[in-house]
Amino acid sequence: GSERTCCPVNWVEHERSCYWFSRSGKAWADADNYCRLEDAHLVVVTSWEEQKFVQHHIGPVNTWMGLHDQNGPWKWVDGTDYETGFKNWRPEQPDDWYGHGLGGGEDCAHFTDDGRWNDDVCQRPYRWVCETELDKASQEPPLL
């Protein structure tokens, strides 16, 4: 069947999700598309516990997550509600800074070296994290 009951090779299972951590960089949209071709999405952080898990695996390196405001409001790529959800921005962020000289503001969110979030130019080639959820059907405990 099409159900994903265990994580693919080279992915890490945590709390019923599978995570894959890149060691090279891409622009945000290319990283997002890469994850989608893996039947996944850029990581969506929904709790402090998940934040710490991801932070542990990526280390002090700028890393894309599945959060952007390219169409106006901030949105998670899987539809998770931004306004009521977990947030971990650095102080004064997001600031949609235009001073970088690359044109436009900053529309894509990434983990910074201390794990807190910043908005940045989406074309920057940062590392990224893919996430896919294990199927609900596979979460039932086996019958004894």
Epitope: S2, G25, D30, N33, R36, E38, D39, P125
Partner: antibody
Framework: EAQLLESGGGLEQPGGSLRLSCAAS????????MSWVRQAPGKGLEWVSV????????YSADSVKGRFTISRDNSKNTLYLQMNSLRAEDTAVYYC??????????????WGQGTMVTVSS | DIQMTQSPSSLSASIGDRVSITCRAS??????LNWYQQKPGKAPKLLIF???SLQSGVPSRFSGSGSGTDFTLTISSLQPEDFATYYC??????????FGPGTKVDIK
């Protein structure tokens, strides 16, 4: 041995339709994103379309967007390309290929032998 | 979109020659660069992925190098079976996997 075998090519008039198939064997088909790549006579390679392993995500080149649709049936280990509104410039050998993803890099590591599509009146 | 160019478009060489083909991207693609070999009437074959990683079963006389925008495929000692057309491909811009125009290697 991993193999891909295309079929469904042939001669079609401009504006017509064709459906290409690609039968996979020797590897876990559903674990790989699959792609179509074409090559016009005497020309280079052009990426056409790609679909994720479970079929939930698809992308196509601008040159075929809205006309060609990629799909797959993992229960049959088969990849498809539905080609509508065919044009003379679609004349090419069409290859299916599997996408290898290693440490963030991607490549097409298994290729079929190709099927020829000719669009002419 | 990222455009790929190759040079030369064709070259003539002798058995045992060291041959180099260059590929250039219109903007930086880090190490997201593959090389393929294609013989007439046959499907392409993956030789090298991620700039320098040799695909399983490919002879060690093939090697790849480069980074950023400029890349090179080198055949250290050309063999009769190496006469073919070689294509580079960028995969930085997922999924717009653009190929170069090809370099044809034939017998001098």
């Amino acid at each position: 041995e991993a193999q891909l075998l295309e079929s469904g090519g042939g001669l079609e008039q401009p504006g017509g339709s064709l459906r290409l198939s690609c039968a996979a064997s020797g590897f876990t088909f559903s674990s790989y994103a699959m792609s179509w790549v074409r090559q016009a006579p005497g020309k280079g390679l052009e990426w056409v379309s790609v679909i994720s392993g479970r079929g939930g995500n698809t992308y196509s080149a601008d040159s075929v967007k809205g006309r060609f649709t990629i799909s797959r049936d993992n229960s049959k280990n088969t990849l498809y390309l539905q080609m509508n509104s065919l044009r003379a410039e679609d004349t090419a050998v069409y290859y299916c290929a599997s996408r290898l993803a290693v440490a963030g890099s991607e490549a097409f590591h298994i290729w079929g032998q190709g099927t020829m599509v000719t669009v002419s009146s | 979109d990222i455009q790929m160019t190759q040079s030369p478009s064709s070259l003539s060489a002798s058995i045992g020659d060291r041959v180099s083909i260059t590929c250039r991207a219109s903007r930086t693609i880090n190490n997201y660069l593959n090389w393929y070999q294609q013989k007439p009437g046959k499907a392409p074959k993956l030789l090298i992925f991620a700039t320098s990683s040799l695909q399983s079963g490919v002879p060690s006389r093939f090697s790849g190098s480069g980074s950023g925008t400029d890349f090179t495929l080198t055949i250290s000692s050309l063999q009769p079976e190496d006469f073919a057309t070689y294509y580079c491909q960028q995969t930085y811009s997922t999924p717009l996997f653009a190929f170069g125009p090809g370099t044809k290697v034939d017998i001098k």
